[in-house]
């Protein structure tokens, strides 16, 4: 089995997590993609998903989460704005590919959000403050329900299913961009990995 790895990101309340999930292959470009949280002892829960089929460069906003799929570069951009301490947890991007199981993108993200406080060495909020303007978006976050044993997702709570932002733009201030790359385990890599493991097993017994 593929070892699941995590990357840890530490941010302060009010900041923005900005990650890029790298899905690499063209065949996944139009596939519906989702951002999930994995809580201890629970199945992965889908917080937001792109439309189906996923539209190019079309922001989908669900609460404080904004997803934007860039087909031409094979990147799904995930932003979680105005982070709160309770947002801390383990997250992952997945690609829906029914009837098959969702395809998980590696690595998972361990987000740690701490209370912000002034006087932190090296931080000057006034000089490093960024302002992001997210265009108004209305979308239906209709995420599929899966019950596969390996990666299970749930539909988001009813309250987040229909989301409409006001006509005015949302100003996202005090933003720190966390840029990361997620590697997709491609078919051939997986094939090579299995071959390597088979060889290792073979040599171990001889």
């Amino acid at each position: 089995a593929t070892k699941l790895t995590e990357e840890k990101y530490e941010l302060k309340e009010g900041q923005t997590l900005d990650v890029k999930c790298d899905y690499t292959l063209e065949k996944f470009a139009s596939s519906q993609k989702a951002w999930q949280i994995i809580r201890d002892g629970e199945m992965p829960k889908t917080l937001a998903c792109t439309e189906r089929p996923s539209k190019n460069s079309h922001p989908v906003q669900v609460g404080r989460i904004i997803l934007e799929d860039y087909h031409d570069h094979g990147l799904l951009r995930v932003r979680m704005v105005n982070l709160q301490v309770e947002d801390s947890g383990l997250y992952q991007c997945v690609i829906y590919q029914p009837p098959k199981e969702p395809h998980m993108l590696f690595d998972r993200i361990r987000l740690v959000v701490t209370k912000g406080f002034s006087g932190t060495p090296g931080s000057n909020e006034n000089s490093t403050q960024n302002v992001y303007k997210i265009p108004p978006t209305t979308t239906k976050a209709l995420c599929p329900l899966y019950t596969s044993p390996r990666t299970v997702t749930q539909a988001p709570p009813k309250s987040t299913a229909d989301v409409s932002t006001p006509d005015s733009e949302i100003n996202l201030t005090n933003v720190t961009d966390i840029i990361r790359e997620q590697k997709l385990i491609s078919e051939e890599d997986l094939e090579q990995k299995l071959i390597s493991e088979e060889d290792l097993h073979h040599h171990h017994h001889h």
Epitope: K20, T24, L25, E26, K27, A29, S30, Y70, H71, D72, H73, G74, L75, R77, D177, I179, E181, L184, S186, E187, E188
Partner: antibody, heavy 121, light 111 residues
Framework: EVQLVESGGGLVQPGGSLKLSCAAS????????MHWVRQASGKGLEWVGR??????????YYAASVKGRFTISRDDSKNTAYLQMNSLKTEDTAVYYC????????????WGQGTLVTVSS | DIVLTQSPDSLAVSLGERATINCRAS??????????LHWYQQKPGQPPKLLIY???NLESGVPDRFSGSGSGTDFTLTISSLQAEDVAVYYC?????????FGQGTKLEIK
């Protein structure tokens, strides 16, 4: 093991045509875009063009120097990419390499050994 | 089209010494802070070989004396301790926009 083997090179007169083939093996051919890159003797590398996958409707893109004269195609059932070269000029003389990227706008990790095309009268 | 200009055109470095090759793009080759800029090594009679992808990622099997850095329009390939087998021509290449383009190449020799 990923392998790319070019064929079809040779001597052709200016104004003539030639079709190069790139036979691929060792990976799921239909999943990846395929590119052609050329190199004139003693010169640098020049990207010729690329063809995307079925998911992207086999879209093609070309360098300005060959646009309108060269056509890239692929046959996923044969694991083969092609470069049809028409209205050849002496400056098209080069070694032509077939290369495969690692995904959307990704790096060229795999290259063929190249096939020589000579355009001369 | 994005023009990539490498400097110097040729470089002679003593064995064991550091070699540095620069690549400047006429416009940014970044998308979301990802630099779609790659480095290749080519020896006579051989196809190019990938060394570094997306500015700073070392390709599997490439010795760690090779490293890449930079973003936006300015990039650098560094060989920390030149070995005899590193004599070759080095190319940068961008894939951020069509048409993809290569730098003109830098010939690396031993002093």
């Amino acid at each position: 093991e990923v392998q790319l083997v070019e064929s079809g090179g040779g001597l052709v007169q200016p104004g003539g045509s030639l079709k190069l083939s790139c036979a691929a093996s060792g990976f799921t051919f239909s999943t990846y875009a395929m590119h052609w890159v050329r190199q004139a003797s003693g010169k640098g590398l020049e990207w010729v063009g690329r063809i995307r996958t079925k998911s992207s409707n086999y879209a093609t893109y070309y360098a300005a120097s060959v646009k309108g004269r060269f056509t890239i195609s692929r046959d996923d059932s044969k694991n083969t990419a092609y470069l049809q070269m028409n209205s050849l000029k002496t400056e098209d003389t080069a070694v032509y390499y077939c290369t495969r990227d690692m995904g959307i706008r990704r790096q060229f990790a795999y290259w063929g050994q190249g096939t020589l095309v000579t355009v001369s009268s | 089209d994005i023009v990539l200009t490498q400097s110097p055109d040729s470089l002679a470095v003593s064995l064991g010494e550091r070699a540095t090759i620069n690549c400047r793009a006429s416009e940014s080759v970044d998308t979301f802070d990802y630099s779609f800029l790659h480095w290749y090594q080519q020896k006579p009679g051989q196809p190019p070989k990938l060394l570094i992808y997306r500015a700073s990622n070392l390709e599997s099997g490439v010795p760690d004396r090779f490293s890449g850095s930079g973003s936006g329009t300015d990039f650098t390939l560094t060989i920390s301790s030149l070995q005899a087998e590193d004599v070759a021509v080095y190319y940068c290449q961008q894939s951020n926009e069509d048409p993809y383009t290569f730098g003109q190449g830098t010939k690396l020799e031993i002093k």
